[in-house]
Amino acid sequence: ILGGREAEAHARPYMASVQLNGAHLCGGVLVAEQWVLSAAHCLEDAADGKVQVLLGAHSLSQPEPSKRLYDVLRAVPHPDSQPDTIDHDLLLLQLSEKATLGPAVRPLPWQRVDRDVAPGTLCDVAGWGIVNHAGRRPDSLQHVLLPVLDRATCNRRTHHDGAITERLMCAESNRRDSCKGDSGGPLVCGGVLEGVVTSGSRVCGNRKKPGIYTRVASYAAWIDSVLA
């Protein structure tokens, strides 16, 4: 997260760290007791590694009573996700067992009504991704409140040049932005999960390259079918 602040500890009990061989790889969001939603591209290079999900964490390194690392029983990328596009960049991870719920571990309601979030709405994005252009990784969860950007502006030739489909949404990126390592994390608007950080190699913090998020409402049928 660029230009953000350290989050209040455990105030985002849905927040997950998707880990590869014990190190943070991507963000994720607990959407059901045994399921974490993340981004498909996160596991592209994870073929031989051990994928796990950390829940109940604020610090990645410090012991915390609520922290627990779960093995992954099943990884379900969206069937239409492809390495070379940002479209359909969703991944569902089934935990090896149901998460132990409590004040610091709780699923987040996700948007099912397939309608765009109004431009100007302030939404929270959080993650353990890099906090500066030098690539510094934080130990504690960071967050930033960003305004949603209208699709027409985001699709300008100077911005994302038509790449933002109706299944994607954008948020402003003027010095404050999601970045490398935040992919798969939640974009939360008014207590409801609206988007998932896409995992392309976009430049961060440049106002002409807004943050891109996969709209979960557009994938409600797929999410329901996997969770069923």
Partner: antibody
């Protein structure tokens, strides 16, 4: 102690412009969105728009686009609203208010300035 | 834009009574609602955020409830300092519109 101190009352002529200020203290100015709200005499409240001092990002109610321009001076922790091409419809009390954040993504206007009265009259 | 319909527009109540003010949104606002109190000639003050949470320093006789499109503010055992106008405001999208207000007067 968070405090938003607004500039004093203004009497302006139709067609003119007026710039009102809101000086923030008691918190980190660049970390919180500042809103502006209009209240006509004996009437309700209307949201004009917000500005984020940390990046100068703004968002306006469609109704006030072209009427209000929001700016900040980070060095003095002051937000400004310029109202242009004034008419009698712009006679009102204008408030600045800070967005406070709650939980992960809820917010509300937790601190308000005392209001600036703008009277448009020839 | 989401419309916020507040009722009643005015009410006359005695000290010690209980009052309820309601606010109806034109669509689901997912508890993204605040209540404010405004005294004559003063700025509004935040009472309740996220539909049900009392702001710092607000007396416990105030309470907010509701979900979806229907919300209410309840004031138990009215005190003389509670008289004034009350406004709801949604934060689900933009613009974050206010209700028309409810003026609470002493009977």
């Amino acid at each position: 102690q968070v405090h938003l101190q607004q500039s004093g009352p203004e009497l302006v002529k139709p067609g003119a412009s007026v710039k009102i200020s809101c000086k923030a203290s008691g918190y980190t100015f660049i970390d919180y969105y500042i809103n502006w709200v209009k209240q006509r005499p004996g009437q309700g409240l209307e949201w004009i728009g917000w500005i984020f001092p940390g990046s100068d990002s703004t968002y306006y109610n469609e109704k006030f686009k072209g009427k209000a321009t929001l700016t900040v001076d980070k060095s003095s922790s002051t937000a400004y609203m310029l109202l242009s091409s004034l008419t009698s419809e712009d006679s009102a009390v204008y408030f600045c208010a800070r967005y406070g954040y709650y939980g992960s993504s809820f917010y509300a206007m937790d601190y308000w300035g005392q209001g600036t009265s703008v009277t448009v009259s020839s | 834009d989401i419309q916020m319909t507040q009722s009643p527009a005015s009410l006359s109540v005695s000290v010690g009574e209980t009052v309820t003010i309601t606010c109806r949104a034109s669509e689901n606002i997912y508890s993204n609602l605040a209540w404010y109190q405004q005294k004559q000639g003063k700025s509004p003050q935040l009472l309740v955020y996220a539909a049900t949470n009392l702001a710092d320093g607000v007396p416990s006789r105030f309470s907010g409830s509701g979900s979806g499109t229907q919300y209410s503010l309840k004031i138990n055992s009215l005190q003389s300092e509670d008289f004034g106008s009350y406004y709801c405001q949604h934060f689900w999208g933009t613009p974050p519109t206010f209700g028309g207000g409810s003026k609470l007067e002493i009977k």
